[in-house]
């Protein structure tokens, strides 16, 4: 079958993301990638939704991430920006209205970015051969 | 091509208030932010503030907190600037600017900018 | 507030001269640094940007130099349509501050 359209939409989201360094890329959150065993493709769209979003919510104002200078602040809107965009498209191929996220693990935002990248790019092969 | 047209010149009495346009086109309104420049005839610019026309967020220069209010309409690709209880100090044309940005804000720079809007202030 | 000063205020130049015009910031702006010109009644017209880029379009004989507090704008072979107001701007944090400008007269 042929691939969503949303799921050609994230990966170049996450392309743009993960070229991005700012202040706050280094900020950790919960590494739901770390024991993903028994979860579906569906859950872990809808969980690392969740998990963005409350990134999203608790850093998109903060001074530290913002910076003091006009790039800095700048380039901290662009990645705010396109979390938000890589929110709502994983909660649209996820189809799921809320979901848990238990893990005690933390990784960075960087390194989740890169393997929610590894994931997606993994499920394009797959759909595109 | 890229253009920003502002609305015409306006006569307004102090202490009134005072709301000038700013029409994007030929390019994504969304995806750049629009800046608003104050200058005094035959003086200097004045950077008042800016707006992201993607969600409306705002950040003015202190000297203008209170007084100016900038907004957009997605819906026209248009961004207003509006002054209240204006004094003959400001009395000028009022540019709107856009801001160029390449390689995530490796550089960025007033690339377009609109006629300017003169506003007279007088009774 | 970082502020801006520009100098000279004005300078009387000739057709064919080389002229440098000087910006200088009040604190560290890196690089972060446009240049432009203004001619009566017109808008400001972008003709560097990032200190030393010249923007598309903008003939050669112009250019930028600088870093940190210190800026310089050179017309080299000045032309009668180089006559104008000079204004620079730095873009390093909000709020973007202005220099007072310099403006060319003709001797």
């Known amino acids: 079958h042929k691939c969503d359209i949303t799921l050609q939409e994230i990966i170049k989201t996450l392309n743009s993301l993960t070229e991005q360094k700012t202040l706050c890329t280094e900020l950790t959150v919960t590494d739901i990638f770390a024991a993903s065993k028994n979860t579906t493709e569906k859950e872990t769209f809808c969980r690392a939704a969740t998990v963005l979003r409350q990134f999203y919510s608790h850093h998109e104002k903060d001074t530290r991430c913002l910076g003091a200078t006009a790039q800095q602040f700048h380039r901290h809107k662009q990645l705010i920006r396109f979390l938000k965009r890589l929110d709502r498209n994983l909660w649209g191929l996820a189809g799921l209205n809320s979901c848990p996220v238990k893990e005690a693990n933390q990784s960075t935002l960087e390194n989740f970015l890169e393997r929610l990248k590894t994931i997606m790019r993994e499920k394009y092969s797959k759909c595109s051969s | 091509q890229v253009q920003l047209q502002q609305s015409g010149p306006e006569l307004v009495k102090p202490g009134a208030s005072v709301k000038i346009s700013c029409k994007a086109s030929?390019?994504?309104?969304?995806?750049?932010?629009i800046h608003w420049i104050k200058q005094r005839p035959g003086c200097g610019l004045e950077w008042i503030g800016m707006i992201d026309p993607s969600d409306g967020e705002t950040r003015l220069n202190q000297r203008f907190q209170g007084r100016a209010t900038l907004t957009v309409d997605e819906s026209t690709s248009t961004a207003y600037m509006q002054l209240r209880s204006p004094t003959s100090e400001d009395s000028a044309v009022y540019y709107c600017?856009?801001?160029?940005?390449?390689?995530?804000?490796?550089?960025?720079?007033?690339?377009?900018w609109g006629a300017g809007t003169l506003v007279t202030v007088s009774s | 507030d970082i502020q801006m000063t520009q100098s000279p205020a004005s300078l009387s130049v000739s057709v064919g001269d080389t002229i440098t015009l000087t910006c200088h910031a009040s604190?560290?702006?890196?690089?972060?640094l446009s240049w432009f010109q203004q001619k009566p009644g017109n808008i400001p017209k972008l003709l560097i940007y990032?200190?030393?880029n010249l923007h598309t379009g903008v003939p050669s004989r112009f250019s930028g130099s600088g870093s940190g507090t210190g800026f310089t704008l050179t017309i080299s072979s000045l032309q009668p349509e180089d006559i104008a107001t000079y204004y620079c701007q730095q873009a390093h944090s909000y709020p973007f501050t202005f220099g007072g400008g310099t403006k060319l007269e003709i001797k």
């Open positions: 990032k200190a030393s």
């Open positions: 604190q560290n702006i890196d690089v972060w």
């Open positions: 600017t856009r801001l160029k940005e390449y390689g995530n804000y490796d550089s960025f720079y007033f690339d377009v």
């Open positions: 030929g390019y994504s309104f969304t995806s750049y932010w």
